[in-house]
Every structure is written in C-alpha cells, then in structure tokens.
C-alpha cells in the first residue's frame, strides 16, 4: 500500500479582495485532503511581495500588508500540502488573488440624456426612465443605486422613483409647465463603502410637436419623445 | 465538447449602444472567466474586458470603462456585452473567448459578431 | 499596461523551412511567485477566429501539433514553427496573460515564399 500525497481540492484557488482591505483580513482559503487520513500543514511558497500569511492548520489565507492594485493584478503564490508525519509527501496549487478597485467612482448617467421632451401643453403628466451607472467594480451583485431630487424647490413639479438598482422614472407632478426648457438635478447615491453620491442633470423640454417631434426651426435635429 | 455560440451581425448609428451575446456549452459554466476581444477591420486583437460568471465579478479595460457593460445570465450560460455611444471607430467583430484552465489565456472563442457603425 | 511588440510584421518562407516570430514584453512575465511565464500564442486565419497555440509561454494546447514550439523567459518570448506547411499560413498573436488588463502584440503574418 503506497503512500500518497496530498490532494487539493481545485488546482488553482482564486480569491478576490478590495485593494484598501484592513490588513489581518481573511482573504481566501485551500483546502487539501490526504487519502490516508494524515493531518496536513499548510504553508505560502513565492509571497515575493509580503503580502500574505497561512493559518497552517486551516489553510486560510489573511493579508498581512496593504495591497497594492498597482503592483499588477492578479497575485498569485504558490500553496503546499504537506503530510504531518510518514513520508512529508507534498502537494503543491496556486493561489490567485485578484485586486478590485475601491469605491472611488460616484455614479453618473449610463447615457448621453441631452434631447428629452414632452410635447406643449401637456395633456397628462408624463414620465421618463433613464439609467445611472458608475465605474466600479461590483462583486456578486449589479449596483444598487438610490434616487432622489437634486433639491427641494424641485419637489413642486418633479418626483424620482426608483425602479431597479439601475434605472429610476422621472414624473412631472402636474401638467402645468412652460414651454422651454428645465434642468432636473438628480442625486444618485451608490450605497458603497465609502457611500458616493453624484449629482446629475437631466435636461428636459416642454416644446410644441408636429407629428410626434419636437418643432424646431430649420438646422435644428429632432428630439426624443418621452411619455 | 466547448462551445461558444454568438448573436449575428448588427449595424447601428453613432451614438447608439449594441448588446452582443454569446451562449456557452460544453462545460461548466461559472468554473471559467469570459472575456470580449475585438478586431476592426485589417486589425489586431484588443482585449475589452471579462467576467467571472460565478459572482458578476467584471474587471474592464480602461479604455472602455463607462461604455462596456459585460452581464451574464447563469440560467441560461449566456455573457452579454453592452457597449454605448458608438462611434464609427467601434466598427469590428468582437469575440467572446472562455479562460483557460488554471489561468487567464484564451482557450476557446467564439465565431465572432460583426457590429458596424455607420450613419 | 504591458505593452507587447512583435516582430517582424510579416514573414515570407518556403515550405518545411523553418519560421521564428519574436514577441517583447515591456514587464517581466516571469511570475516569480509560481515560476510561470504568462505568455499565449495563437494562430488566426482570415475570416475565422483565433485559435490557441501555446499557453504559460512553452505549453502546447491540446490538438496543436508539435511543429510549433513556444520558448523564451522574463521578456523575450518566441514562437516556433520547425517546418512550415501551407495550413500554416495565417497571423500570428502572442499575449500576455500576466497581469490585467490583458493585451496582445500587433500581429505577424506568415506567408509562403
């Protein structure tokens, strides 16, 4: 009967953590089985840049260092799975750890929005959807945005509602407005840690319609109609 | 055995925003990262960004940040890649391409999607 | 970003010659932490999409056959094929797999003289 190695679980473990991760923090485990039932220690081979540590018992992985997404993305060590007594038979996977951004984008407009319009007078209130989005990166999840009005003197003719994560309706609160043009200021708040919020405009014109489209004098293109 | 089936041709106005998709088989879906590359016409390769479809984990390129959104649909092992306000300069085909085992190269591509943006 | 330079451009000759394309990094690829060279060749024929060659700089993928050859460490990296044959005329890509955002060299065609 011969003695055997140690076998991982998966031939590469992928862990992924935020660049600003407190250090001491867990960041990722290994797992390793021995097929005669020894105890197995776990141990780090090519941390070149400090970074990590290996509970030998466990095979959790903390950072012991700040890390530094810049330094180049993904990380990886080699893991060892050695025997705890017989032959010290070893075993040998990567570790992968993969730097996320940290919440430094505050959200924004997925879209170019200029050319919204209802069509003067309107005859109901009207709505529009638009959709936020911002450059982070965001794990198991999509973002979850929350929506309000920029400020209060807004809240006599507009209201925001949120429909998703992503995307939110503007509603005017009445039918009676004038026939030019009015910038709704919009606070969208990412929720993140640090929480960041951006302000953004949305440019909307009441304007008279033939056939459907805005009415503008010649050189002028067409814009978008919105209910 | 692995196979990488993408949506057909679209031709769009500048501005506009295209959404290409590209269905997995042959494996197990969420054990692989997916990645878009793209080739304009009598060009080389250029990597856009990719997507670990077990956690929505997406790491882009930053020339592309804020116009690529890459989503995924496990139910149905579908990537989706969005990208907006197209210009004439985003004519090209663009891959799907699965990771490779253990690591980050491309093992498997898709047919490719020709997106051409013109007015 | 690591920047990737291949050369040459193209490449002309003739059948059962041998064909060397040269791929520069401009960072190590050689991950001293795992003793890997993050380096890929592949091969794209017009009208279809790549195909992998070589990955980890000198391993063959599977169905690739042995006349293609992958070496080179750190930052100079070349492909190798022993004995041309007309199947082989195409592009030829490398990339690095190292560190993020991945990137590709310019390309090299590979004609028949």
């Known amino acids: 009967d011969v003695n055997e190695a140690p076998q991982f679980s998966q031939h590469v473990f992928q862990a992924k953590v935020s660049e600003d991760v407190a250090i001491g923090t867990k960041v990722g485990n290994v797992t390793a089985k021995d097929p005669e039932g020894l105890d197995i220690s776990y141990s780090l081979r090519g941390d070149t840049r400090g970074w990590l540590k290996i509970d030998h018992v466990t095979g959790e992985i903390f950072s012991v260092a700040p890390l530094d997404r810049e330094a180049g993305s993904p990380y990886r060590v080699q893991v060892v799975a050695t025997e705890v007594g017989g032959s010290s038979l070893s075993s040998v996977s990567e570790f992968h750890l993969i730097l996320m951004d940290v919440n430094d984008n505050p959200p924004r407009l997925a879209k170019d929005y200029t050319g919204l319009f209802f069509c003067h007078p309107l005859s109901a209130p009207g709505s529009l959807i638009f959709e936020a989005t911002d450059d982070d990166q965001h794990l198991f999840r999509g973002p979850h945005f929350t929506f309000s009005l920029g400020s209060g003197s807004l809240q006599n003719d507009w209201e925001v509602s949120k429909i998703n994560g992503t995307h939110a309706r503007l509603s005017t609160r009445h039918t009676e407005f004038e026939e030019r043009e009015y910038v709704v200021l919009i606070r969208i708040n990412d929720g993140g840690r640090p929480p960041l919020e951006g302000i953004v405009s949305l440019p909307v014109t009441f304007c008279s319609c033939v056939e459907g489209s805005c009415f503008r004098p010649a050189g002028h293109k067409h814009h978008h109609h919105h209910h | 055995q692995v196979q990488l089936v993408q949506s057909g041709a679209e031709v769009k106005k500048p501005g506009a925003s295209v959404k290409v998709s590209c269905k997995a088989s042959?494996?197990?879906?969420?054990?692989?990262?997916m990645n878009w590359v793209r080739q304009a016409p009598g060009q080389g390769l250029e990597w856009m960004g990719a997507i670990d479809p077990s956690d929505r984990y997406t790491n882009y390129n930053q020339k592309f940040k804020g116009r690529v959104t890459m989503t995924v649909d496990t139910s149905t092992s579908t990537v989706y890649m969005e990208l907006s306000s197209l210009r004439s300069e985003d004519t090209a085909v663009y891959f799907c391409?699965?990771?490779?085992?253990?690591?980050?190269?491309?093992?498997?591509w898709g047919q490719g999607t020709l997106v051409t943006v013109s007015s | 970003d690591i920047v990737m330079t291949q050369s040459p451009d193209s490449l002309a000759v003739s059948l059962g010659e041998r064909a060397t394309i040269n791929c520069k990094s401009s960072?190590?690829?050689?991950?001293?932490?795992?003793?890997?060279?993050?380096l890929a060749w592949y091969q794209q024929k017009p009208g279809q999409p790549p195909k992998p060659l070589i990955y980890?700089?000198?391993t063959r993928e599977s169905g690739v056959p042995d006349r293609f050859s992958g070496s080179g460490s750190g930052t100079d990296f070349t492909l190798t094929i022993s004995s041309l044959q007309a199947e082989d005329v195409a592009v030829y890509y490398c990339q690095q797999h190292h560190y993020f955002p991945w990137t590709f060299g310019g390309g090299t065609k590979v004609e028949i003289k």
């Open positions: 980890f700089a000198s």
């Open positions: 391409a699965r990771g490779g085992y253990g690591d980050y190269w491309f093992a498997n």
């Open positions: 042959g494996y197990t879906f969420t054990d692989y990262w």
């Open positions: 960072q190590n690829l050689l991950s001293s932490g795992t003793q890997k060279n993050y």
